[in-house]
């Protein structure tokens, strides 16, 4: 029987920069029931805080609700664990709420051929930001970036469509089935989840010339 | 404890490229951003680039944008910072370092480093 | 870019003195700012961030005060460990960059 081994805080996300969560990995039991706190302060404070809420985000987790989230803040967290033997800490977690934001994916994704008379035809890619992101005070600026492959094709092609949200794809196969899908990053962040993929039937008169 | 080990100085001719390498240790590699910045003899320092080893997702210092290539493994938790086009003025000391949180760029581990040489 | 200006080059200062580096930047950068400190042949070593917060372990001798364009690392008495080169490095936009340095030597 030994004290509990080193935890480690491994993760941390936000939906929206509004709430948070940090996720941290137990070190070794040492072979007796342990109990984990995780306590944190913010830059410029001293005084240290206990997690507000260890349900929400599941075992081994601490949930930030509004209350408890501010941006532009820098929050020192680490985890103790502690069992009959002894206790140890986790190395000290700085986090800025600001770069932790994964979004859901975008939403209403549509996909289109366009055929015009005067052009070349093209496939055209159209979504819609996120529900939870308040793009309005521009707090926030997505990235995107779509994905598409012919239905049985191993390889995805990629495109970055930067801040907006619509896109233009020339060079398609004719009479392809294609799955189509977009993801969304904050300029500071990670990317969202793809996307539901949306199916295209590429009709075989579909010119690339 | 936090390790950021980094591969062997390197002696070069102008116009090819080297690759160093970054082995991390002590801590979950895919969630801290790594930076690659260098030291050029007795001056001082350039950040290069950064990548996010969660997805390999990068950014780069424009000077530097078509010679530059970071790249991370997660599999033997390794970042790597390929430059290509070397010429006399890339003799340097090439450093890793690793991001200090979850949080804006300041670097609060950083590798030993790897003195890469060109010369004719 | 934003340039960040380190004056002066080389201070020259007795262990137990107080010792106070500038560096200016070339725009506003608000408080994100980072200050290292580098002895001959090792890597640099992380003192401060957010321009005034010491990081884990840092003696309390070090500080930082300024926001904006102007900032200044004050060493309240410098110790024999203390002299070294310090850079400051500016991460409110990219490119990331740094200082050229101040050499605190002994005087």
């Known amino acids: 029987q030994l004290p509990p081994g080193k935890p480690e805080i491994f993760k941390c996300r936000s939906p929206n920069k509004e709430t948070f969560t940090c996720w941290w990995r137990p070190g070794t039991d040492g072979g007796l029931p342990t109990n984990y706190s995780l306590t944190y302060h913010r830059e410029g404070e001293t005084l240290m805080h206990e997690c507000p809420d260890y349900i929400t985000g599941g075992p081994n987790s601490c949930h930030f609700g509004k209350q408890y989230t501010s941006m532009w803040r820098t929050y020192i967290m680490m985890v103790n664990a502690t069992n009959q033997m002894g206790s140890s800490f986790s190395d000290e977690l700085y986090v800025d709420v600001t770069y932790i934001v994964q979004p859901d994916p975008p939403l209403e994704l549509a996909v289109e051929v366009k055929q015009p008379e005067d052009r070349k035809p093209y496939l055209w890619i159209k979504w819609s930001p996120p529900t939870l992101i308040d793009l309005k005070t521009g707090w926030f600026t997505l990235l995107y970036e779509i994905r598409l492959k012919p239905e049985k094709a191993a390889e995805w092609e990629i495109h970055f469509a930067g801040q907006q949200t619509e896109f233009k794809i020339l060079s398609l196969h004719p009479g392809q089935k294609y799955l189509v899908q977009v993801r969304c990053k904050p300029d500071h962040g990670y990317w969202s989840a793809w996307s539901p993929a949306t199916f295209i039937q590429i009709p075989s008169d579909f010119t690339m010339n | 404890q936090v390790q950021l080990v980094q591969s062997g100085a390197e002696v070069k001719k102008p116009g090819s490229s080297v690759k160093v390498s970054c082995k991390a240790s002590g801590y979950t590699f895919t969630t801290y951003w790594m930076h690659w910045v260098r030291q050029a003899p007795g001056q001082g320092l350039e950040w290069m680039g950064e990548i996010d080893p969660s997805d390999s997702y990068s950014n780069y210092n424009q000077k530097f944008k078509d010679r530059v290539t970071i790249t991370a493994d997660k599999s033997t938790s390794t970042a790597y910072m390929e430059l290509s086009s070397l010429r006399s003025e890339d003799t340097a000391v090439y450093y890793c370092a690793r991001n200090g949180g979850l949080g804006p760029a300041w670097f609060s581990y950083w590798g030993q480093g790897t003195l890469v040489t060109v010369s004719s | 870019e934003i340039v960040m200006t380190q004056s002066p080059a080389t201070l020259s200062v007795s262990p137990g003195e107080r010792a106070t580096l500038s560096c200016k930047a070339s725009q506003y950068v608000g408080t994100a700012v980072a200050w290292y400190q580098q002895k001959p042949g090792q890597s640099p070593r992380l003192l401060i961030y957010?321009?005034?917060n010491r990081y884990t372990g840092v003696p309390a001798r070090f500080s930082d005060s300024g926001s904006g364009t102007e900032f200044t690392l004050t060493i309240s008495s410098l110790q024999s460990e203390d002299f070294a080169v310090y850079f400051c490095?500016?991460?409110?936009?990219?490119?990331?960059?740094f200082g050229g340095g101040t050499k605190v030597e002994i005087k």
């Open positions: 490095q500016q991460y409110s936009s990219y490119p990331w960059t």
């Open positions: 957010s321009a005034s």
